[in-house]
Interface confidence: low
């Protein structure tokens, strides 16, 4: 049996040893680097937090996020005639969510099976890259959307092709930036075999030499550049937006807009409080603790924060709802199992019968559908 060098290894906070041991396979004896983890790490990797709580949350995110973002993308691409900058940003937001959420069945299976990754190195890297990529894409597209919403209130000029082209350019630049900043996640070996638990982890255990310095520097840079700066822009946009709305006209129409804008602000604030702030803060604190103390005491909080960050895929549809008239129509009718065409026909028929009030209702077998939106 070949025994390798004993270098200390730490996972996200998982402390142990690298043991270059012979691992017997069907094809004979192959030498590979295997990791032994300490009992704290084992308790996390075998405990209910990772094997029960995480898959439950990820299942909810998948069940809610896949259809809602799928519908949103379809609405923005094929059911929205005018491609306003807001529509472009929301379409990208929905695409980012979908690219992350489609891998969740593998993530759920991984956690349910005791954090055992059986799908190969490449898929693990894709999953992790898309996981973090989605979070940072969401932050950036949300920032663009927030700044754009403020801009619309300040300059309520009509839709121009030039503005749409700028939005497309910005979106492509964001995708390119995210691709570049997540390259380290695709390059680093993310799967580690732990014989003590007879599992292969995906991202949960990482080599110390990579982890201690590099991971702290990496996530600190991302937290400053792709979280704090966009968060400041978003907050500024909303503070200015609230000021503008407070001094604007108080008619019914503007009141509706004001309420929707407030709901959008509350939704985005909730997303920052639940999804983005805890995860970015704890990513930095967690890796700082490992770097400075050799152990992270916030590991459980860190896992919960990263898990909650995926809820942005469930919260984003609320943003679409408050911003997009078309998505609102399709969402309402999807929930009522009606096609938009049917409702439009109802509206036409009612209008022709001189029901020209601002909000008329169509009643049929105890179901009331508001026909003006």
């Amino acid at each position: 049996t070949i025994q390798g060098t004993n270098r200390s290894s730490k996972g996200r906070s998982l402390i142990g040893k690298v043991d270059g041991t012979s691992h017997v396979t069907g094809k004979g004896v192959t030498v590979e680097t295997v990791f032994s983890v300490d009992e704290f790490s084992a308790s996390v990797l075998t405990g209910k937090l990772t094997t029960v709580f995480l898959p439950i949350v990820y299942t909810i995110v998948f069940v809610v996020g896949l259809p809602s973002n799928g519908m949103a993308l379809w609405v923005f691409l094929f059911r929205t005639k005018k491609k306003h900058p807001a529509v472009i940003y929301m379409a990208n937001l929905a695409l980012a969510d979908l690219l992350s959420v489609i891998w969740f069945p593998l993530k759920i299976a991984y956690h349910i099976h005791g954090n055992n990754w059986i799908y190969g190195e490449a898929l693990c890297n894709v999953l992790i890259g898309f996981f973090y990529g989605n979070m940072y894409c969401s932050i950036l597209f949300m920032t663009c959307l927030s700044v754009q919403r403020y801009w619309v209130i300040v300059n309520p000029m009509g839709h121009s092709r030039k503005k749409a082209n700028i939005a497309i350019g910005i979106s492509l630049a964001i995708w390119l930036l995210i691709l570049l900043v997540t390259i380290p996640l695709y390059v680093v070996k993310q799967t580690i075999f732990i014989p003590a638990l007879n599992i292969t982890t995906c991202h949960d255990v990482l080599p110390e030499q990579l982890l201690v310095g590099d991971m702290f520097n990496y996530f600190l840079s991302l937290a400053i550049g792709v979280f704090l700066f966009p968060a400041f822009l978003t907050a500024s946009a909303y503070v200015l937006m609230i000021r503008m709305l407070r001094s604007s006209a108080m008619d019914e129409n503007s009141e509706k807009k004001r309420k929707r804008a407030i709901k959008l602000i509350v939704t985005v604030l909730a997303m920052y409080l639940i999804c983005f702030t805890p995860s970015n803060l704890l990513l930095v604190v967690h890796y700082f603790l490992i770097k400075s103390q050799g152990q992270s005491h916030v590991y459980a909080l860190y896992i919960v924060a990263l898990c909650l960050s995926t809820l942005n895929s469930c919260i984003d549809p609320f943003v679409y709802y408050f911003v997009s008239h078309d998505f609102r129509d399709h969402a309402k009718n999807a929930l009522l199992c009606r096609s938009v065409r049917t409702v439009k026909q109802m509206q036409v028929s009612l209008t022709s019968k001189k029901h020209s009030r601002k909000s008329s209702s169509y009643s049929s077998s105890s179901t009331t559908v508001k026909t003006s939106y």
Epitope: Q3, I15, K17, D38, E39, S43, P195, A196
Partner: antibody
């Protein structure tokens, strides 16, 4: 019920190889790790090495150059081989079972006394 | 290698007396494990994960500590507690034991 039983020679010549067998019953070697621990007369316990459920091994760095642990899952046996024995290797050799989690030896064999002497 | 230093090496206690054994690690360990061994018998798991009692262990036994300093306590010594107690770490290979503390009845 769970049992571990060590077997092997009671006396070994210096510079020779020690071969011990730990025969287990009441559990599967693919579900539990098995470790070897020794105890020289009147002294403390020394962890020697472990064979994990997956079949790979980890050793005490002081012994790894002359120690080898293997197993036969079909026979429910774990083997210890240690070469170049010296008189200071005289000890009671125990095999002990450890689960995936929590980490502790919940069952031990009764031990086999091995004397290294010419 | 993490070296575990137990103190005292030997200890004599009267029935009803409180007994404390300490175990210091040369570097930080996540948890400490304790085993009891009576003369001529195999060791038995006594305390795992620093403070959890193994099955069948009376609740007069307790464990505590963190980092590099851990302790094992018997709140009220009883005759059957006379044995040698070993601390053990699973934090990194080699998974070392302490030299042991021999607890005798006074």
């Amino acid at each position: 019920q769970v049992q571990l039983k060590e077997s092997g020679p009671g006396l070994v010549q210096p510079s020779q190889t020690l071969s011990l067998t730990c025969t287990v019953s009441g559990f599967s070697l693919t579900n539990y790790h098995v470790s070897w621990v020794r105890q020289p007369p009147g002294k403390g316990l020394e962890w020697m090495g472990i064979i994990w459920t997956g079949g790979s091994t980890a050793y005490n760095s002081l012994l790894k150059s002359r120690l080898s642990i293997s197993r036969d899952t079909s026979k429910s046996q774990v083997f210890l081989k240690m070469n170049s024995l010296q008189t200071e290797d005289t000890a009671t050799y125990y095999c002990a079972r450890r689960g995936l989690y929590p980490y502790y030896f919940d069952y031990w064999g009764q031990g086999v006394m091995v004397t290294v002497s010419s | 290698e993490i070296v575990l230093t137990q103190s005292p090496t030997t200890l004599a206690a009267s029935p009803g007396e409180k007994v404390t054994i300490t175990c210091r690690a040369s570097s930080r360990v996540s948890n400490m494990y304790w085993y009891q061994q009576k003369s001529g018998a195999s060791p038995k798991a006594w305390i795992y994960e620093t403070s959890k009692l193994a099955s069948g262990v009376p609740d007069r036994f307790s464990g505590s500590g963190s980092g590099t300093s851990y302790s094992f306590t018997i709140s009220s010594m009883e005759t059957e507690d006379a044995a040698t107690y070993y601390c053990h770490q699973w934090t990194s290979t080699p998974y070392t034991f302490g030299a042991g503390t021999k607890l005798e009845l006074k």
